[in-house]
Interface confidence: medium
């Protein structure tokens, strides 16, 4: 499968460059004064963090003390209280709420830019294309606000941002100016740009929801690297539903469930639906401690 080759050759290409003694770029960025961008919610602007550790999950550590501490929650974009065990843990731990805010929040971090359905493009249309931090390159489409048209780009397979569409039509429907604006719920059969086969694709819609569930529920469906065609379900965080997709049998990401029920159980509970009058309809969800399978430092941190 070509996707594997793309990953491998990214490495070989670099090695070859050194062997040829051609100038290779140095990517040893200093961690000081570095900003990190995280997309956690379809309706919020990109979350900019002054420090990468602000993206780490709250870690109580292995010890048994009960100490009140604060951590920055990337889903709520707020500093929150948690109980620290007294040893180990990580840097996303602060003695006071003020210290947490100082280290991890910015003045504009919680500013919500409202979009009016049928009149304005969703905010994510204005984000720059972002390949993410992975290297499983696949063809995707993004809206280029400078040229006012959808364009093709290479997506690394994880993270990035919401200005990322599987098909050109999705991108055009949502972000390009047209006579009908963008379409809200188009479930046509479209060409899937990932595997070049005809599959039903759900069109992304301007978000009427907020998401506070596990991080992997926000990732796009990822077919993976192999050749199988297994029926799986992924959580589409834009429309708030579990949708079927074909899994190749290897690779991919955590947003991959063998049944719709399993998918709903894992992801639906984190969903909050917005209603037009500004109120919120909350779905039932237990506020139990989230155990995110992939550490935030591995999946969320993206150098600007």
């Amino acid at each position: 499968m070509i996707y594997t080759m793309k990953k491998v050759h990214a490495l070989w290409a670099s090695v070859c460059l050194l062997l040829n003694l051609a100038p290779a770029p140095l990517n040893a960025d200093s961690e000081e004064d570095e900003e990190h961008t995280i997309i956690t919610d379809t309706e919020l602007p990109p979350l900019k963090l002054m420090h990468s550790f602000c993206a780490f999950k709250a870690d109580d550590g292995p010890c048994k003390a009960i100490m009140k501490r604060f951590f920055f929650n990337i889903f709520t974009r707020q500093c929150e209280e948690f109980i620290y065990g007294g040893c180990e843990g990580n840097q996303n731990r602060f003695e006071s709420l003020e210290e947490c805010k100082k280290m991890c929040t910015r003045d504009n971090a919680n500013r919500i830019i409202k979009t009016t359905l049928q009149q304005e493009k969703p905010d994510f249309c204005f984000l720059e294309e972002d390949p993410g931090i992975c290297r499983g390159y696949i063809t995707r489409y993004f809206y280029n606000n400078q040229t006012k048209q959808c364009e093709r780009f290479k997506y690394g397979g994880c993270l990035g941002n919401m200005n990322n569409f599987e098909t050109l039509e999705e991108c055009k429907n949502i972000c390009e100016d047209g006579p009908n604006g963008f379409q809200v719920d188009n479930y046509g059969t479209q060409l899937n740009a990932v595997n070049n086969s005809l599959t039903p694709q759900s069109t992304k819609v301007p978000s009427l929801f907020e998401f506070h569930g596990p991080s992997w529920c926000l990732t796009p469906a990822d077919r993976g690297l192999c050749r199988a065609n297994e029926n799986r379900f992924y959580y589409n965080s834009v429309i708030g539903k579990c949708r079927p997709f074909k899994y190749s049998g290897c690779g991919g990401n955590e947003n991959n469930f063998t049944s719709k029920q399993e998918c709903l159980r894992a992801c639906k509970k984190g969903f909050i639906q917005r209603i037009s009058k500004g109120g919120l309809i909350k779905t039932k969800r237990k506020r139990k401690k989230q155990r995110v399978k992939i550490a935030y430092e591995e999946i969320f941190v993206k150098n600007m």
């Epitope: 793309k6 070989w12 390159y137 098909t167 060409l191 005809l198």
Partner: antibody
């Protein structure tokens, strides 16, 4: 054998129009996107536009959007480029190329057709 | 738009020489680079895609490499039939852009 054969080039006056065609054969037409790329005399290559043969979704180089229109006819296994409001600087050899999604590159090219814009 | 710069318009070589043609992108193109060969009066021919993968039928004396913004096409032992124009192209994002070309000629 994959073959892309362009036609429709020729001499046209500034402000005029021209429609280029590209007949594709030797592969399943709907399996690959098709692109137009041009090359001015003695100059480099310049990507113009791309089309998905199944649904007709198009991508353009912003430089040509509005004046040039890419289209296709599945029944005829053909690609087209409608060029309007032509200028002297549009003088070039226009190539039809098959865009292979797995490679993300243009793996087969036609022989090209020369468009000359001059009064 | 991403600008692809091939700093050498011409490169002189001899049969059997090793030659490296370089290409620099104006921003990180994440190894999404292809190389094409064009002989006089002919259409371009794909040699390399994804920076280092040889296209079907391309002799193994052609190798590509690079990452970030810097990419190189190397011909390990130049043959007479290799004298041509070589173009790099980024396929990271549209509009796809090409380098200005490097003409390989005999010394």
């Amino acid at each position: 054998e994959v073959q892309l054969v362009e036609s429709g080039g020729g001499l046209v006056q500034p402000g005029g129009s021209l429609r280029l065609s590209c007949a594709a054969s030797g592969y399943t037409f709907t399996d690959y996107n098709l692109d137009w790329v041009r090359q001015a005399p003695g100059k480099g290559l310049e990507w113009v536009a791309d089309i998905n043969p199944i649904n007709g979704a198009t991508l353009y180089n912003q430089k040509f959007k509005g004046r040039f229109t890419i289209s296709r006819d599945q029944a005829k296994n053909s690609l087209y480029l409608q060029m309007n409001s032509l200028r002297a600087e549009d003088t070039a050899v226009y190539y039809c190329a098959r865009y292979y999604g797995d490679y993300d590159a243009m793996d087969y090219w036609g022989q090209g057709t020369l468009v000359t814009v001059s009064s | 738009d991403i600008v692809m710069t091939q700093s050498h318009k011409f490169m002189s070589t001899s049969v059997g020489d090793r030659v490296s043609i370089t290409c620099k992108a104006s921003q990180d193109v994440h190894t999404a680079v292809a190389w094409y060969q064009q002989k006089p009066g002919q259409s371009p021919r794909l040699l390399i895609y994804w920076a280092s993968t040889r296209h079907t039928g391309v002799p193994d004396r052609f190798t590509g490499c690079g990452s970030g913004t810097d990419y190189t096409l190397t011909i390990s032992s130049v043959q007479a039939e290799d004298l041509a124009l070589y173009y790099c192209q980024q396929h990271y994002t549209t509009p796809y852009t090409f380098g200005g070309g490097t003409k390989l000629e005999m010394k």
